[in-house]
Interface confidence: low
């Protein structure tokens, strides 16, 4: 039975040209995290593999930095970065846990970070 839950940074906003940290945290399970994938819609951004370390997709390597922890830092944000991001925790023996973050990149200089929330 899958007992874990994923906490994420939730719905967040940031300024165009700035940077943002996407973070997820898996709790309430003793399952071993083997790999974490970060995806934007259907595009792979990065992989953090327990054995092999980080891999950043070539098309994002200039704007994506690994960490902190299992999180991901997006830099030089553009309005086109607005959208859904997913952290996909591959664990054993539980299987896959998925967290969702919605990022809005604003032209305005006023960009408030959303509160953390737990996915039901």
């Amino acid at each position: 039975m899958m007992t874990g839950t994923i906490e994420t940074t939730g719905n967040i906003s940031a300024e165009k040209g700035g940077s943002i940290i996407l973070q997820c945290h898996l709790s309430s399970t003793t399952a071993q995290v083997t790999q974490v994938n970060w995806e934007q819609q259907d595009q792979l951004l990065a992989i953090c593999n327990a054995d092999l370390g980080w891999h950043i997709s070539p098309s994002f390597k200039d704007r994506v930095a690994p960490g902190p922890g299992l999180g991901l830092t997006l830099q030089s944000l553009t309005v086109n970065d607005t959208g859904e991001y997913f952290c996909i925790y591959h664990t054993y023996p539980d299987g896959t846990y998925t967290g969702r973050i919605f990022l809005e990149v604003l032209e305005s200089s006023v960009a408030e970070h959303g509160a953390r929330f737990q996915i039901p």
């Epitope: 899958m2 874990g4 839950t5 994923i6 790999q35 994938n37 995806e39 819609q41 259907d42 595009q43 792979l44 992989i47 859904e84 997913f86 996909i88 591959h90 539980d94 299987g95 896959t96 846990y97 998925t98 969702r100 996915i119 039901p120």
Partner: nanobody, 120 residues
């Protein structure tokens, strides 16, 4: 709501191959990950493999790594499990499972299962 229907099970000799299919219908846009579990007679259901919506993230149980391959065809809304070098201990009912984007993990939706028997 999402419905999952498995097919492709049957009787195969040790060392043989089978390909299972899991066809998704309904609110398929809400699916984020799909995977396979199995349950042998008298045993608990165990995780086999999983694949993320984009197809770039896959993970396997140690017992099937190198022998089984999970894949997905988004145009057909179908996930596949190619099983090679089958062993008698692979005999089980194989279940397809899926998770929603906002889910905590695989197992939101289950298929009815398809029986795989490996015997000479």
């Amino acid at each position: 709501e999402v419905q999952l229907v498995e097919s492709g099970g049957g009787l195969v000799q040790p060392g043989g191959s089978l390909r299972l299919s899991c066809a998704a219908s309904g609110s398929i846009s809400s699916i984020h990950a799909m995977g396979w579990f199995r349950q042998a007679p008298g045993k608990e259901r165990e995780f086999v493999a999983t694949i993320s919506r984009s197809g770039v993230g896959t993970f396997y149980a140690d017992s099937v790594k190198g022998r089984f391959t999970i894949s997905a065809d988004n145009s057909k809304n179908t996930a596949y499990l190619q099983m090679n070098s089958l062993k008698p201990e692979d005999t089980a009912v194989y279940y397809c499972a899926s998770s929603y984007s906002s889910s905590s993990g695989l197992g939101d939706i289950w298929g009815q299962g398809t029986l795989v028997t490996v015997s000479s």
